[in-house]
């Protein structure tokens, strides 16, 4: 009765358990009773990342600069190339097949987390006491200017999009204050 199963680094073919090819190599010929499995290394731009019985190696991924992609890690005979996005762009998926421009945070919003090659900018609304008057992919919400520390008074209240406007203290009120 021929075998119906094989060990993990083997595969069943013609009632034989043959050795799988190691990562980085492809199958050239199956084993026989008297000859071992024949494997050959993958070519320059090819890889296989598992113990396998593949007759063709996989092509390394191409990081297309026209799609905003660049090589993050060069592929080997055992690993695929890893692509990432050019500065200012991020991947649209985990496989990083294309890139999109980092989102900017509108006025009234600040950057909570700066974008990376794989994640977009995360914005947050500026809370009371903070503002952002620019559209930016880097700027956080800034605190309102403290007029008091400059010995000035608030002439115009701040908003989430504008800073407070400080002005000189009223001379008369200032004078009475000291009497």
């Amino acid at each position: 009765e021929p075998p119906t199963a094989c060990r993990e680094k083997q595969y069943l073919i013609n009632s034989q358990c043959c050795s799988l090819c190691q990562p980085g190599q492809k199958l050239v010929s199956d084993c026989t009773e008297f000859t071992e499995t024949e494997c050959l290394p993958c070519g320059e731009s090819e890889f296989l990342d598992t113990w396998n019985r593949e007759t063709h190696c996989h092509q390394h991924k191409y990081c297309d600069p026209n799609l905003g992609l660049r090589v993050q890690q060069k592929g080997t005979s055992e690993t695929d190339t890893i692509c990432t996005c050019e500065e200012g762009w991020h991947c649209t998926s985990e496989a990083c097949e294309s890139c999109v421009l980092h989102r900017s945070c509108s006025p009234g919003f600040g950057v909570k987390q700066i974008a990376t090659g794989v994640s977009d900018t995360i914005c947050e609304p500026c809370p009371v006491g903070f503002f952002s008057n620019v559209s930016s992919a880097f700027e956080k919400c800034h605190p309102w200017t403290s007029c008091e520390t400059k010995d000035l008074v608030v002439q115009q209240a701040g908003t989430n999009k504008t800073d407070v406007v400080c002005g000189p203290q009223d001379r008369l009120r200032h004078h009475h204050h000291h009497h």
């Epitope: 075998p3 060990r7 993990e8 008297f34 071992e36």
Partner: antibody, heavy 127, light 107 residues
Framework: EVQLLESGGGLVRPGGSLRLSCAAS????????MNWVRQAPGKGLEWVSY????????DYADSVKGRFTVSRDNSKNLLYLQMNSLRAEDTAVYYC????????????????????WGQGTMVTVSS | DIQLTQSPSSLTASVGDRVTITCRSS??????LAWYQQKPGKPPKLLIY???SLLGGVPSRFSGSGSGTDFTLTISSLQPEDFATYYC?????????FGQGTKLEIK
Amino acid sequence: EVQLLESGGGLVRPGGSLRLSCAASGFTPGSYEMNWVRQAPGKGLEWVSYISSAGETTDYADSVKGRFTVSRDNSKNLLYLQMNSLRAEDTAVYYCARDVFFFDSSGDNGAYGMDVWGQGTMVTVSS
Amino acid sequence: DIQLTQSPSSLTASVGDRVTITCRSSQGIRSSLAWYQQKPGKPPKLLIYGASSLLGGVPSRFSGSGSGTDFTLTISSLQPEDFATYYCQQLNSFPSTFGQGTKLEIK
């Protein structure tokens, strides 16, 4: 230290059942294929069963097929052999043994061997 | 199933002797063969895998050779601790099988 320790052996009547356990220490058994091998008193070694590292593939000697079931609990580092419909000829010392794949990337195909064995547990089937 | 036949079944030799044990397979198994040493009351101990590769820690007086159907285990110069029973095992396909054993006794 890498060790395997069998337990669960004993005296059982013909037709009875027994469950053997094999506890692994010093290594992660979930990364290895495992076997049960037995040895009747004064006799040679007889391979009994095999289980793959995740437990999805099993195989058995013809003499125990349909009566014995091998299983594993990788979260507890345990290997089991459920033995049903026991016969007098199942009387033996039962060893659990680790399958290891020896591989040198500069070499060719690699090779298997059983490099770690437990001390064994005695199973006696008698009326 | 693949049958393994060891010869001789028993062997008497002296310390310092060169000893050869053979293992013949009923069908070709390439180099999927291991050799074990077993002493009374103890579990087997792996010596050689892949027909000819010596396990780390095993003395270099042990060597294995062969491929296909004919295999040999050689002990170049017997030491007192080498007197034991030796088994070959095929790991080519299931069911895995062992030879019947060769008992090496002191003369």
